[in-house]
Interface confidence: medium
């Protein structure tokens, strides 16, 4: 949702630097008055300063993505100017001592790297598609999700700094930028007002009709859903072995999508729900102001049935799920199993380098199509992830295990745990293939409650 | 189980202080950005404060600014938030969150302590 300002860390190094650079001798009290420095720059024309040594010489500035290396020896002679050093810039014309460095994008903030940094601009952050940015301080940004005005029409679209601004179907009244059904309106809230017609409607004139369907559309509805539970769990094993059975040679599956054009739907969304002071928030429901989507590609219910391992946390809302599947997500009482890894008191061990069953474990359990996501969230780069492919020809199982071998190496041996793994796959909404993971080491048996790996 | 528990909210007059104590359990604490977060009676929540993991970092909402300063004990599990110069539109429900590393979710919430500044 458009271009970034530098992030907030910067500030004082620019500060710092434009200090040092204007002013090389860095004793604060040989610093002219500002009056005086004024009179002294209006000296030179544009584009050039005045000789720290000197006041007589002119000497041209530097050109952005360049540094002063050295003042210029006499009038009409040349500024000795240096290219910055990779991880460094300049963006204007400057008689800097040094070029800055570059700054970084904060991924804890859901911040994407808009444009890399060069020479003579800064790297520009920003946040996904239909993301708006909270800000913290004028330069410190953070990204959420845009509302989708579900049960609503969007009033004002998503800016770049400002989320949607939704109004309400009738029936619905607006609690944290998401349309709630007047039924959940309690009589101490504001809604009162709002759903106030709606209320006295149900109460006065209940159509009987309604009374006696309703019950029974709920009950078709929860029988359709239970079989079509027990039809997915049964043809997940069938689809997995189909999936992985892509023998090397044969065809790969098809490119992920981009970055910025795809947003990923949550497995079990949960209509998000803000408490009323007295309210305890269970896992379920919990107050969210925003959320954010974490994936690079789209995703299909088939990635990674997750049936097995709902999310303890709160889902991203606004995401328009059936409620009667977000309730038994959500109160499920099945812990995931990264939940037990992190609860647990064991340090997590690391991983046997040794035993390729590992690392194949977790090639057989990713989904093809999140699978670049993934390693990229590991740390490779794009670089490395299409040399690797090119190296493997069209063996793509090969392709990846080399993937994970590379993380694995270049990462300290305490830190390359299955834990790590987890949070990853954590953040991209797979924990069904977590325990998938888990369940091919260790067996169909009882999860362990420690987050060992290898027996 | 991941658990955050407010404490030391109350009746306070306008002008007085407060501190806030979030203790945390159940995941690495020192590893996540820490947030505090409020909700006003009938009215949206509202982002108070933010404090990195190494507690080097401090952000607040403009409407708190210079009262409010957030701080952390990692040895101790703890998330405070020590409020002066209360005033009465402070009052809310105050929640400590926490969140995952990647995104900006919040994936855990305390369930909340009740700050009310009258006189």
């Known amino acids: 949702m458009g271009l970034s300002t530098v992030p907030d860390l910067l500030l004082p190094l620019v500060l710092l630097e434009l200090l040092v650079g204007i002013y090389p001798s860095g004793v604060i009290g040989l610093v002219p008055h500002l009056g005086d420095r004024e009179k002294r720059d209006s000296v030179c024309p544009q584009g050039k300063y005045i000789h720290p040594q000197n006041n007589s010489i002119c000497c041209t500035k530097c050109h952005k993505g360049t540094y002063l290396y050295n003042d210029c020896p006499g009038p009409g002679q040349d500024t000795d100017c240096r290219e910055c050093e990779s991880g460094s810039f300049t963006a204007s014309e400057n008689h800097l001592r040094h070029c800055l460095s570059c700054s970084k994008c904060r991924k804890e903030m859901g911040q994407v790297e808009i444009s890399s940094c060069t020479v003579d601009r800064d790297t520009v952050c920003g946040c996904r598609k239909n993301q708006y940015r909270h800000y913290w301080s004028e330069n410190l940004f953070q990204c959420f999700n845009c509302s989708l005005c579900l049960n609503g029409t969007v009033h004002l679209s998503c800016q770049e700094k400002q989320n949607t601004v939704c109004t309400c179907h009738a029936g619905f009244f607006l609690r944290e930028n998401e349309c709630v059904s007047c039924s959940n309106c309690k009589k101490s809230l504001e809604c009162t007002k709002l759903c106030l017609p709606q209320i006295e409607n149900v109460k006065g004139t209940e159509d009987s009709g309604t009374t006696v369907l309703l019950p029974l559309v709920i009950f078709f509805g929860l029988c359709l859903l239970s079989l079509l539970f027990i039809g997915l769990m049964y043809r997940y094993q069938r689809w997995k072995s189909k999936l992985y059975s892509i023998v090397c040679g044969k065809s790969t599956p098809e490119k992920e999508g981009e970055l910025e054009g795809t947003t990923t739907k949550p497995l079990a969304p949960n209509p998000s729900f803000s408490p009323t002071p007295g309210f305890t928030p269970t896992l379920g429901f919990s107050p969210v102001p925003s959320s954010t989507f974490t994936s690079s590609s789209t995703y299909t219910p088939g990635d990674c049935p997750n049936f097995a391992a709902p999310r303890r946390e709160v889902a991203p809302p606004y995401q328009g799920a059936d409620p009667i599947l977000a309730t038994a997500l959500a109160s499920d009482p099945i812990p995931n199993p990264l939940q037990k890894w992190e609860d647990s008191a064991h340090k997590p061990q690391s991983l046997d380098t040794d035993d390729p069953a590992t690392l194949y474990a977790v090639v057989e359990n990713v989904p093809p199509l999140r699978w670049k996501e993934f390693v990229r969230r590991l740390g490779l780069s794009d670089h490395e992830i299409d040399r690797l492919e090119l190296q493997n020809g069209r063996c793509l199982r090969e392709a990846q295990y080399s993937m994970l071998a590379t993380w694995r190496r270049r990462t300290p041996r305490r830190e390359a745990t299955l834990e790590l793994l987890g949070r990853v796959l954590r953040d991209m909404d797979l924990l069904g293939c977590l325990e998938d993971i888990e369940e091919a080491l260790c067996g169909p048996a009882a999860l362990p409650p420690a987050p060992s790996l290898l027996r | 189980e991941v658990q955050l528990l407010e404490s030391g909210g109350g009746l306070v007059q306008p002008g007085g202080s407060l501190r806030l104590s979030c203790a945390a359990s159940?995941?690495?604490?020192?590893?996540?950005?820490m947030y505090w977060v409020r909700q006003a009676p009938g009215k949206g929540l509202e982002w108070v404060s933010f404090?990195?993991?190494?507690?080097?970092?401090?952000y607040y909402a403009d409407s708190v600014k210079g009262r409010f300063t957030i701080s952390r004990d990692n040895s101790k599990n703890t998330l405070y938030l020590q409020m002066n110069s209360l005033r009465a539109e402070d009052t809310a429900v105050y929640y400590c969150a926490k969140t995952l590393s990647a995104d900006g979710r919040f994936d855990y919430w305390g369930q909340g302590t009740l700050v009310t500044v009258s006189s």
């Open positions: 159940g995941f690495t604490f020192i590893g996540y950005n």
């Open positions: 404090i990195s993991p190494s507690g080097r970092e401090t």
